[in-house]
Protein backbone atom coordinates (compact mmCIF):
# COMPACT_ATOMS: atom_id res chain seq x y z
CA UNK A 1 0.00 0.00 0.00
CA UNK A 2 1.15 3.55 -1.35
CA UNK A 3 0.59 7.06 -0.63
CA UNK A 4 -0.01 9.49 -3.33
CA UNK A 5 -0.32 12.68 -3.42
CA UNK A 6 -3.77 14.74 -4.52
CA UNK A 7 -4.26 18.20 -5.45
CA UNK A 8 -7.48 20.08 -5.53
CA UNK A 9 -7.92 24.32 -5.27
CA UNK A 10 -8.86 25.57 -1.75
CA UNK A 11 -11.78 27.62 -2.93
CA UNK A 12 -14.47 26.84 -5.07
CA UNK A 13 -17.47 29.57 -5.29
CA UNK A 14 -20.87 27.75 -6.60
CA UNK A 15 -22.09 29.43 -9.58
CA UNK A 16 -25.75 31.40 -8.59
CA UNK A 17 -27.63 27.86 -10.15
CA UNK A 18 -26.14 26.03 -7.58
CA UNK A 19 -23.03 24.53 -9.74
CA UNK A 20 -19.72 24.47 -8.62
CA UNK A 21 -16.25 22.84 -10.62
CA UNK A 22 -13.08 21.87 -9.35
CA UNK A 23 -10.00 19.72 -10.69
CA UNK A 24 -8.85 16.77 -8.76
CA UNK A 25 -5.28 16.19 -9.74
CA UNK A 26 -3.38 13.04 -8.61
CA UNK A 27 0.33 12.36 -9.07
CA UNK A 28 -0.25 8.23 -10.22
CA UNK A 29 3.39 6.66 -9.58
CA UNK A 30 2.51 3.28 -11.34
CA UNK A 31 0.57 2.61 -14.89
CA UNK A 32 -2.95 2.78 -13.07
CA UNK A 33 -6.31 0.92 -15.49
CA UNK A 34 -8.79 1.04 -12.64
CA UNK A 35 -9.27 4.25 -10.48
CA UNK A 36 -12.02 5.13 -7.95
CA UNK A 37 -12.66 8.66 -7.35
CA UNK A 38 -15.21 9.82 -4.34
CA UNK A 39 -15.99 12.76 -3.30
CA UNK A 40 -16.30 13.33 0.29
CA UNK A 41 -18.20 16.64 2.58
CA UNK A 42 -17.00 17.08 5.55
CA UNK A 43 -18.90 19.39 8.06
CA UNK A 44 -18.45 20.19 11.66
CA UNK A 45 -17.03 16.48 12.13
CA UNK A 46 -19.34 14.78 9.92
CA UNK A 47 -17.76 13.20 6.89
CA UNK A 48 -20.76 12.23 4.41
CA UNK A 49 -20.07 10.78 0.72
CA UNK A 50 -20.96 13.09 -2.06
CA UNK A 51 -20.64 10.76 -4.70
CA UNK A 52 -17.58 7.76 -5.93
CA UNK A 53 -16.62 6.70 -9.79
CA UNK A 54 -14.93 3.82 -10.85
CA UNK A 55 -13.60 4.24 -14.51
CA UNK A 56 -10.96 2.59 -16.55
CA UNK A 57 -7.87 4.97 -17.36
CA UNK A 58 -9.26 5.94 -20.80
CA UNK A 59 -12.69 5.77 -20.75
CA UNK A 60 -15.61 7.91 -19.56
CA UNK A 61 -16.09 9.27 -16.10
CA UNK A 62 -19.22 7.54 -14.87
CA UNK A 63 -20.88 8.46 -11.35
CA UNK A 64 -23.71 5.89 -10.72
CA UNK A 65 -25.80 5.79 -7.52
CA UNK A 66 -28.04 8.90 -8.63
CA UNK A 67 -25.20 11.41 -8.44
CA UNK A 68 -25.61 14.78 -7.99
CA UNK A 69 -22.26 14.58 -9.65
CA UNK A 70 -20.59 14.79 -13.38
CA UNK A 71 -16.97 14.85 -14.11
CA UNK A 72 -14.38 13.74 -16.91
CA UNK A 73 -11.04 12.23 -16.86
CA UNK A 74 -8.02 13.44 -18.76
CA UNK A 75 -4.30 11.58 -17.86
CA UNK A 76 -3.96 11.73 -13.79
CA UNK A 77 -7.11 15.15 -14.17
CA UNK A 78 -10.57 14.40 -13.28
CA UNK A 79 -12.59 17.31 -13.84
CA UNK A 80 -15.50 17.52 -10.93
CA UNK A 81 -19.07 18.96 -11.13
CA UNK A 82 -21.18 19.19 -8.33
CA UNK A 83 -25.08 20.42 -8.97
CA UNK A 84 -28.15 21.43 -7.18
CA UNK A 85 -26.26 22.95 -4.09
CA UNK A 86 -27.86 25.15 -1.89
CA UNK A 87 -26.46 27.58 0.92
CA UNK A 88 -26.62 24.89 3.41
CA UNK A 89 -24.21 22.50 1.32
CA UNK A 90 -21.55 24.99 1.71
CA UNK A 91 -18.79 22.81 3.60
CA UNK A 92 -14.89 21.05 2.02
CA UNK A 93 -15.14 18.96 -0.06
CA UNK A 94 -12.25 16.10 -0.15
CA UNK A 95 -11.21 14.52 -3.46
CA UNK A 96 -10.23 10.66 -2.80
CA UNK A 97 -8.48 8.99 -5.11
CA UNK A 98 -7.12 5.24 -5.47
CA UNK A 99 -5.52 3.45 -8.11
CA UNK A 100 -7.45 0.04 -7.59
CA UNK A 101 -5.75 -1.90 -10.92
CA UNK A 102 -2.89 -3.01 -10.67
CA UNK A 103 -1.50 -3.54 -7.74
CA UNK A 104 0.09 -2.09 -5.55
CA UNK A 105 -3.11 -0.29 -3.96
CA UNK A 106 -2.31 3.43 -4.00
CA UNK A 107 -4.76 5.99 -2.06
CA UNK A 108 -4.43 9.37 -2.14
CA UNK A 109 -6.63 12.47 -0.24
CA UNK A 110 -6.81 15.94 -1.07
CA UNK A 111 -6.68 18.63 1.15
CA UNK A 112 -10.34 19.50 0.63
CA UNK A 113 -12.24 22.39 -1.63
CA UNK A 114 -14.12 24.80 0.64
CA UNK A 115 -17.22 25.56 -1.42
CA UNK A 116 -19.14 28.39 -0.83
CA UNK A 117 -22.76 28.15 -2.02
CA UNK A 118 -24.92 31.23 -1.53
CA UNK A 119 -29.17 30.82 -2.36
CA UNK A 120 -29.95 33.18 -5.03
CA UNK A 121 -32.52 35.87 -3.65
CA UNK A 122 -35.86 35.78 -4.42
CA UNK A 123 -37.16 38.32 -7.51
CA UNK A 124 -38.75 40.91 -5.88
CA UNK A 125 -42.57 41.23 -6.73
CA UNK A 126 -42.81 44.13 -8.89
CA UNK A 127 -46.44 45.82 -10.24
CA UNK A 128 -45.31 46.63 -13.72
CA UNK B 1 -31.17 3.70 17.12
CA UNK B 2 -29.69 1.51 14.46
CA UNK B 3 -31.27 -1.86 13.93
CA UNK B 4 -29.29 -4.63 10.82
CA UNK B 5 -31.61 -7.37 11.17
CA UNK B 6 -29.62 -10.63 9.39
CA UNK B 7 -32.27 -13.65 7.77
CA UNK B 8 -32.28 -16.62 5.79
CA UNK B 9 -29.27 -18.56 7.16
CA UNK B 10 -30.02 -22.67 7.18
CA UNK B 11 -28.50 -25.73 6.46
CA UNK B 12 -27.49 -26.45 3.23
CA UNK B 13 -25.85 -29.02 0.89
CA UNK B 14 -22.43 -28.65 -1.26
CA UNK B 15 -22.89 -26.69 -4.28
CA UNK B 16 -26.64 -25.43 -2.46
CA UNK B 17 -27.70 -22.01 -2.68
CA UNK B 18 -28.96 -19.59 -0.37
CA UNK B 19 -29.84 -15.69 0.29
CA UNK B 20 -29.58 -13.86 2.97
CA UNK B 21 -31.36 -10.93 3.74
CA UNK B 22 -30.59 -7.88 6.15
CA UNK B 23 -33.08 -5.62 6.83
CA UNK B 24 -31.91 -2.37 8.21
CA UNK B 25 -33.94 0.46 10.43
CA UNK B 26 -32.87 3.91 12.53
CA UNK B 27 -30.73 5.48 9.65
CA UNK B 28 -31.50 6.81 6.18
CA UNK B 29 -30.66 3.17 4.42
CA UNK B 30 -29.63 5.11 1.07
CA UNK B 31 -26.76 6.99 2.47
CA UNK B 32 -24.39 4.70 3.38
CA UNK B 33 -22.24 1.78 2.11
CA UNK B 34 -22.87 -1.88 3.56
CA UNK B 35 -21.02 -4.62 3.86
CA UNK B 36 -20.85 -8.31 4.83
CA UNK B 37 -18.72 -9.64 7.11
CA UNK B 38 -18.14 -13.38 8.28
CA UNK B 39 -17.38 -15.75 11.46
CA UNK B 40 -16.66 -19.30 10.73
CA UNK B 41 -17.40 -21.32 14.21
CA UNK B 42 -14.33 -20.51 16.74
CA UNK B 43 -12.35 -18.72 14.39
CA UNK B 44 -11.79 -15.44 12.97
CA UNK B 45 -13.41 -12.14 11.17
CA UNK B 46 -13.89 -12.35 7.26
CA UNK B 47 -14.93 -9.47 5.23
CA UNK B 48 -17.04 -11.01 2.26
CA UNK B 49 -18.96 -7.95 0.05
CA UNK B 50 -19.19 -4.53 -0.02
CA UNK B 51 -21.97 -2.41 -2.13
CA UNK B 52 -21.85 1.20 -2.78
CA UNK B 53 -25.00 3.46 -1.54
CA UNK B 54 -27.10 3.18 -4.33
CA UNK B 55 -25.68 -0.04 -5.63
CA UNK B 56 -23.72 1.05 -8.51
CA UNK B 57 -19.93 -0.46 -7.06
CA UNK B 58 -19.64 -3.66 -5.14
CA UNK B 59 -16.62 -5.32 -3.65
CA UNK B 60 -15.36 -9.07 -3.20
CA UNK B 61 -12.43 -10.91 -1.61
CA UNK B 62 -11.12 -13.73 -3.96
CA UNK B 63 -12.26 -16.64 -1.98
CA UNK B 64 -16.08 -15.75 -2.49
CA UNK B 65 -15.74 -13.32 -6.13
CA UNK B 66 -17.97 -15.27 -8.57
CA UNK B 67 -19.88 -17.13 -6.22
CA UNK B 68 -21.71 -14.66 -3.83
CA UNK B 69 -23.69 -11.50 -4.99
CA UNK B 70 -24.21 -8.37 -2.44
CA UNK B 71 -27.42 -6.44 -3.53
CA UNK B 72 -29.65 -3.86 -2.14
CA UNK B 73 -33.25 -2.66 -2.30
CA UNK B 74 -33.09 0.63 -1.15
CA UNK B 75 -36.79 1.19 -1.36
CA UNK B 76 -37.22 -2.03 0.99
CA UNK B 77 -34.75 -0.84 3.52
CA UNK B 78 -32.80 -4.24 2.70
CA UNK B 79 -29.45 -5.84 1.95
CA UNK B 80 -29.01 -9.12 0.13
CA UNK B 81 -26.31 -11.70 -0.31
CA UNK B 82 -27.09 -14.39 -2.65
CA UNK B 83 -24.65 -17.31 -2.36
CA UNK B 84 -24.18 -19.65 -5.16
CA UNK B 85 -21.89 -22.94 -5.49
CA UNK B 86 -21.58 -23.57 -1.45
CA UNK B 87 -18.84 -24.93 0.00
CA UNK B 88 -17.91 -26.54 3.51
CA UNK B 89 -15.53 -23.85 3.76
CA UNK B 90 -18.41 -21.29 3.73
CA UNK B 91 -20.20 -22.43 6.71
CA UNK B 92 -20.02 -19.45 9.07
CA UNK B 93 -22.28 -16.96 11.01
CA UNK B 94 -22.89 -14.02 8.56
CA UNK B 95 -22.69 -10.39 10.02
CA UNK B 96 -24.06 -7.55 7.65
CA UNK B 97 -22.30 -3.96 8.34
CA UNK B 98 -23.20 -0.84 8.15
CA UNK B 99 -20.27 1.72 7.06
CA UNK B 100 -19.46 5.18 8.61
CA UNK B 101 -16.67 7.40 7.26
CA UNK B 102 -14.37 8.47 10.25
CA UNK B 103 -11.98 11.51 10.24
CA UNK B 104 -9.39 9.52 8.01
CA UNK B 105 -12.03 9.82 5.48
CA UNK B 106 -12.18 5.95 5.07
CA UNK B 107 -14.85 3.10 5.81
CA UNK B 108 -14.96 1.29 8.99
CA UNK B 109 -17.91 -1.35 10.01
CA UNK B 110 -19.64 0.94 12.75
CA UNK B 111 -22.90 -0.93 13.36
CA UNK B 112 -23.22 -4.69 13.31
CA UNK B 113 -26.41 -7.06 13.33
CA UNK B 114 -26.55 -10.40 15.26
CA UNK B 115 -25.33 -12.67 12.32
CA UNK B 116 -27.55 -15.22 10.39
CA UNK B 117 -25.24 -18.67 10.61
CA UNK B 118 -25.48 -20.27 7.12
CA UNK B 119 -24.08 -24.41 7.48
CA UNK B 120 -23.22 -26.16 4.75
CA UNK B 121 -23.04 -29.86 4.90
CA UNK B 122 -23.44 -32.96 3.35
CA UNK C 1 -3.40 -9.26 0.55
CA UNK C 2 -1.91 -7.35 3.84
CA UNK C 3 -1.97 -9.92 6.60
CA UNK C 4 -2.51 -8.30 9.99
CA UNK C 5 -0.98 -10.25 12.68
CA UNK C 6 -1.98 -10.32 16.59
CA UNK C 7 -0.36 -10.75 19.68
CA UNK C 8 -0.83 -12.51 21.85
CA UNK C 9 -3.75 -14.83 21.16
CA UNK C 10 -4.86 -15.33 24.37
CA UNK C 11 -4.51 -13.46 27.57
CA UNK C 12 -5.00 -13.67 31.46
CA UNK C 13 -5.60 -10.96 33.45
CA UNK C 14 -7.19 -9.16 36.49
CA UNK C 15 -9.55 -7.07 37.09
CA UNK C 16 -7.86 -3.38 37.72
CA UNK C 17 -5.13 -4.68 35.40
CA UNK C 18 -3.30 -2.31 32.41
CA UNK C 19 -2.93 -4.47 29.24
CA UNK C 20 -1.94 -4.12 25.65
CA UNK C 21 -2.85 -6.12 23.04
CA UNK C 22 -0.58 -5.55 19.60
CA UNK C 23 -1.40 -5.63 16.00
CA UNK C 24 1.19 -6.24 13.37
CA UNK C 25 0.39 -5.00 9.22
CA UNK C 26 2.32 -6.97 6.44
CA UNK C 27 3.47 -3.86 5.00
CA UNK C 28 2.49 0.10 5.99
CA UNK C 29 -0.92 0.70 6.15
CA UNK C 30 -0.72 4.48 7.45
CA UNK C 31 -3.23 4.66 10.37
CA UNK C 32 -5.90 3.16 8.60
CA UNK C 33 -6.69 0.68 11.42
CA UNK C 34 -9.82 -0.32 13.66
CA UNK C 35 -10.70 -2.43 17.07
CA UNK C 36 -13.35 -4.45 17.35
CA UNK C 37 -14.74 -6.57 20.53
CA UNK C 38 -16.89 -9.35 20.20
CA UNK C 39 -18.56 -11.30 23.25
CA UNK C 40 -19.32 -14.50 23.33
CA UNK C 41 -22.72 -15.28 20.91
CA UNK C 42 -22.88 -11.48 19.72
CA UNK C 43 -21.74 -8.96 17.16
CA UNK C 44 -18.29 -7.66 17.18
CA UNK C 45 -18.65 -3.61 18.35
CA UNK C 46 -16.17 -1.20 17.15
CA UNK C 47 -13.91 0.19 19.51
CA UNK C 48 -11.51 2.31 18.10
CA UNK C 49 -11.01 3.71 14.24
CA UNK C 50 -7.88 5.46 12.57
CA UNK C 51 -5.79 3.70 14.81
CA UNK C 52 -6.64 6.22 17.92
CA UNK C 53 -10.23 7.34 17.77
CA UNK C 54 -12.58 6.41 19.97
CA UNK C 55 -15.62 5.17 18.59
CA UNK C 56 -19.02 6.39 20.03
CA UNK C 57 -19.74 4.98 23.71
CA UNK C 58 -16.78 3.83 24.44
CA UNK C 59 -15.39 4.40 27.59
CA UNK C 60 -11.84 6.45 27.83
CA UNK C 61 -10.09 3.70 29.25
CA UNK C 62 -9.39 2.10 25.84
CA UNK C 63 -6.78 3.77 23.86
CA UNK C 64 -5.35 3.17 20.60
CA UNK C 65 -2.03 3.83 19.18
CA UNK C 66 0.59 3.36 16.37
CA UNK C 67 0.67 4.24 12.86
CA UNK C 68 2.56 2.46 9.71
CA UNK C 69 3.02 -1.13 11.03
CA UNK C 70 2.83 -1.40 14.66
CA UNK C 71 -0.62 -1.04 16.73
CA UNK C 72 -1.27 -1.03 20.14
CA UNK C 73 -4.65 -1.05 22.23
CA UNK C 74 -4.43 -0.58 25.51
CA UNK C 75 -7.05 -0.77 28.38
CA UNK C 76 -5.98 1.43 31.30
CA UNK C 77 -7.84 -0.48 34.01
CA UNK C 78 -9.83 -3.56 33.25
CA UNK C 79 -13.53 -3.93 34.45
CA UNK C 80 -15.13 -6.99 34.05
CA UNK C 81 -17.30 -6.23 31.30
CA UNK C 82 -13.80 -5.92 29.42
CA UNK C 83 -13.45 -10.02 29.43
CA UNK C 84 -13.62 -10.70 25.52
CA UNK C 85 -12.10 -11.19 22.25
CA UNK C 86 -10.16 -8.10 20.02
CA UNK C 87 -9.64 -7.96 16.67
CA UNK C 88 -7.43 -5.37 14.55
CA UNK C 89 -8.88 -4.95 11.10
CA UNK C 90 -7.06 -2.72 8.84
CA UNK C 91 -9.25 -0.46 6.06
CA UNK C 92 -6.59 0.48 3.37
CA UNK C 93 -7.20 -1.22 0.13
CA UNK C 94 -8.73 -4.25 -0.54
CA UNK C 95 -9.57 -6.79 1.11
CA UNK C 96 -9.99 -5.54 4.35
CA UNK C 97 -8.52 -8.51 6.33
CA UNK C 98 -8.48 -8.69 10.19
CA UNK C 99 -5.97 -9.93 12.88
CA UNK C 100 -6.66 -13.42 14.07
CA UNK C 101 -7.88 -11.92 17.58
CA UNK C 102 -7.00 -11.81 21.59
CA UNK C 103 -8.84 -13.78 23.67
CA UNK C 104 -8.95 -11.77 26.97
CA UNK C 105 -9.55 -13.97 29.92
CA UNK C 106 -9.80 -13.35 33.41
CA UNK C 107 -7.04 -14.76 35.97
Known amino acids: CKAMHVAQPAVVLASSRGIASFVCEYASPGKATEVRVTVLRQADSQVTEVCAATYMMGNELTFLDDSICTGTSSGNQVNLTIQGLRAMDTGLYICKVELMYPPPYYLGIGNGTQIYVIDPEPCPDSDF | EVQLVESGGGLVQPGGSLRLSCAAS????????MSWVRQAPGKGLEWVAT????????SYPDSVKGRFTISRDNSKNTLYLQMNSLRAEDTAMYYCAREDYGSSYVHWFAYWGQGTLVTVSA | DIQMTQSPSFLSASVGDRVTITCRAGENIYSYLAWYQQKPGKAPKLLIYNARTLAEGVPSRFSGSGSGTEFTLTISSLQPEDFATYYCQHHYGSPRTFGGGTKLEIK
Open chain 2, 26 to 33: GFTFSSYT
Open chain 2, 51 to 58: ISRGGGYT
